[in-house]
Interface confidence: low
């Protein structure tokens, strides 16, 4: 399977909400012994390998934001911890999974990574990630709503195998 990032750049005004999205592509094994661990974290540019750093999103680390379920099942994060930080990660039946960030501030600007780990018999078998950038703007030049920029076809399937 692969992870696609429909948009590589999100430009949003301060105070707005944004939903960053990744999509699971390709054949997904629905066997009883196969589950998927999906999560989000921040990273930094200028690395040899994109998404190699695992930084918290608003003090929530990648395991705080994770979803753990079978194939294309729907799921979302526990509401208490994440929602206190204005965050919610979710997954639908179609392979889409996302993180919603509420009331954006300039500090939210940066590189965000989605991570999917396929787990068989409790062992990590395959891992892929996708990356996208969020720019939060303020002042007269800021857009009134979030503007999204589609990924190039090359970028939209950002694959990193274990």
């Amino acid at each position: 399977f692969k992870v696609a990032t429909p948009y590589s750049l999100y430009v949003c005004p301060e105070g707005q909400n944004v939903t960053l999205t990744c999509r699971l592509l390709g054949p997904v094994d629905k066997g009883h012994d196969v589950t998927f661990y999906k999560t989000w974290y921040r990273s930094s540019r200028g690395e040899v390998q994109t998404c190699s750093e695992r930084r918290p999103i608003r003090n929530l680390t990648f395991q705080d934001l994770h979803l753990h379920h079978g194939g294309h099942q729907a799921a979302n994060t526990s509401h208490d911890l994440a929602q206190r930080h204005g965050l919610e990660s979710a997954s639908d039946h179609h392979g889409n999974f996302s993180i919603t960030m509420r009331n954006l501030t300039l500090l939210d600007s940066g590189l965000y990574c989605c991570l999917v780990v396929e787990i068989r018999h409790h062992h990590s078998e395959h891992r892929v990630h996708g990356a996208m950038e969020l720019q939060v703007q303020t002042g007269k030049d800021a857009p009134s709503n979030c503007v999204v920029y589609p990924s190039s076809s090359q970028d939209s399937e950002n694959i990193t195998a274990a």
């Epitope: 661990y37 690395e47 695992r54 918290p56 929530l60 680390t61 395991q63 994770h66």
Partner: antibody
């Protein structure tokens, strides 16, 4: 109670491969956020981070040694391994394994260390 | 790589003194900085994490401060058991790097 213990050959000749084992208890490397690093310290000198392995088998290496390092794990037996190929006298050091937890609000530090295993590379 | 520079490399102080050790990062490491104490013949022991948080069981005379590129470890009312080498370590980015160490001795 969290404990880690390193095991190594003690003495190697130049060009041989070093195989180290870190056996741990008190935590599971299958748990989200857990990770184990290898760190070394030549006698009387400072600490040098070598490699890290995450719970999900993601791995990180020190670029200065990356071509010679391989880190791996066996979560079911609570062990982490490190191989260093083509050792030289400069690899003479005490090798530590240490737990690094990426946890809520206070991640990215080594909270538990093994006692260390000493390697001497000599012809 | 982020280079961590500690100063001084060694210092001598009297019992009861307040001792300050500094650590400078070549790049911004936010607050992802830890301090470790290594007594002669022993393993490193975590003292401070996230720049200023005292690890469980560490005496309150140890404190840490700073963010970005400049950090300080302070030991107030120096005790005989504080004789050790102290290391800072950044966790901002790989490769993880340590300072060269500060060897603390009693006058």
């Amino acid at each position: 109670q969290v404990t880690l213990k390193e095991c190594g050959p003690g003495i190697l000749q130049p060009s041989q491969t070093l195989s180290l084992t870190c056996s741990f208890s008190g935590f599971s490397l299958s748990t989200s956020g857990m990770g184990v690093s290898w760190i070394r310290q030549p006698s009387g000198k400072g600490l040098e981070w070598l490699a890290h392995i995450y719970w999900d088998d993601d791995k990180r290496y020190n670029p200065s040694l990356k071509s010679r390092l391989t880190i791996s794990k066996d979560s079911s037996s609570n062990q982490v391994f490190l191989k260093i190929t083509s050792v030289d006298t400069a690899d003479t050091a005490t090798y530590y394994c240490a737990r690094r937890l990426d946890g809520y609000n206070d991640p990215y530090y080594f909270d538990y260390w093994g006692q260390g295993t000493t390697l001497t590379v000599s012809s | 790589d982020i280079v961590m520079t500690q100063s001084p490399s060694s210092l001598s102080a009297s019992l009861g003194d307040t001792v300050t050790i500094t650590c400078h990062a070549s790049q911004n490491v936010n607050v992802w900085l830890s301090w470790y104490q290594q007594k002669p013949g022993n393993i490193p022991k975590l003292l401070i994490y996230k720049a200023s948080n005292l690890h469980a069981g560490v005496p309150s005379r140890f404190s840490g401060s700073g963010s970005g590129t400049g950090f300080t470890l302070t030991i107030s009312s120096l005790q005989p058991e504080d004789i050790a080498t102290y290391y800072c370590q950044q966790g901002q980015s790989y490769p993880l790097t340590f300072g060269g160490g500060t060897k603390l001795e009693i006058k």
